[in-house]
């Protein structure tokens, strides 16, 4: 014999008090699958948590974090404090990245600058606490007569001095 509750769609529950008919989920509750005997209470996004998606009869509310914080954990169960770019969050709070490391985001850890020489390249732009180094052409490409890097100066007619 088929369970009559299996016919109850998402957004409803199988109401045992009413001969197992399908009743809509009450306000502030939801059921995301069919055949449910109860509806789940909607999550409320309070305090540091802001509503990203409202609860509906078939899906729970989704929260994110107020500015100055970012989500951690499954479904944004926690909000972690942001730091500034060029910092990382340690057990003693936000600390500047050590020399040779950078962080270009408000979260996460400081990462070492790219070692350009490992790729046979030179440093084109130095790194900072907020930005990685920019690697340029290999040192060999920068040697005199390497036309791929510095185009030759246009030939001048004899007797003309530079402008």
């Amino acid at each position: 014999l088929q369970d009559p509750c299996s016919n109850c769609p998402a957004g409803t529950f199988c109401d045992n008090n009413r001969n197992q008919i399908c009743s809509p989920c009450p306000p502030n509750s939801f059921s995301s699958a069919g055949g449910q005997r109860t509806c789940d209470i909607c999550r409320q996004c309070k305090g540091v948590f802001r509503t990203r998606k409202e609860c509906s009869s078939t899906s729970n509310a989704e929260c994110d974090c107020t500015p100055g914080f970012h989500c951690l954990g499954a479904g944004c169960s926690m909000c972690e404090q942001d730091c500034k770019q060029g910092q990382e969050l340690t057990k003693k709070g936000c600390k500047d990245c050590c020399f040779g490391t950078f962080n270009d985001q408000k979260r996460g850890i400081c990462r070492p600058w790219t070692n350009c020489s490992l790729d046979g390249k030179s440093v084109l732009v130095n790194g900072t606490k907020e930005r990685d180094v920019v690697c340029g052409p290999s040192p060999a490409d920068l040697s005199p007569g390497a036309s791929s890097v510095t185009p030759p100066a246009p030939a001048r007619e004899p007797g003309h001095s530079p402008q």
């Epitope: 540091v48 948590f49 100055g68 914080f69 926690m78 909000c79 972690e80 404090q81 969050l89 057990k91």
Partner: nanobody
Framework: QVQLVESGGGLVQPGGSLRLSCSAS????????MSWVRQAPGKGLEWVSD????????FYEDSVKGRFTISRDNAKNTLYLQMNSLRAEDTAVYYC?????????????????WGQGTLVTVFP
Amino acid sequence: QVQLVESGGGLVQPGGSLRLSCSASGFTFSSYAMSWVRQAPGKGLEWVSDINSGGESTFYEDSVKGRFTISRDNAKNTLYLQMNSLRAEDTAVYYCAKHPLTYTIATMNDYDYWGQGTLVTVFP
């Protein structure tokens, strides 16, 4: 071991004020967000307010906004709740609670340590 001890509760008339304190020990107080939660007679737990580790970010339940102020003194390892314009519906046991991760604000289900509570009774 972690200890949270609330004080400052008592009897007060509607419109009156109270200041609750929560003395913390057994952990690096200045690294953790803290909360106040209350439980009215015969009701479930209700989140009241959060404060981040440094004290510069505070958050309140709508019904207490503008009346309650959460603060902390990290040098004294103490959390406070200043309660003004008290109403009968503020009658409850007030608990302070610690958040589980440093520099992080969690939902009430995840608080890892709670005090024993202090009773606030607002009576006409």
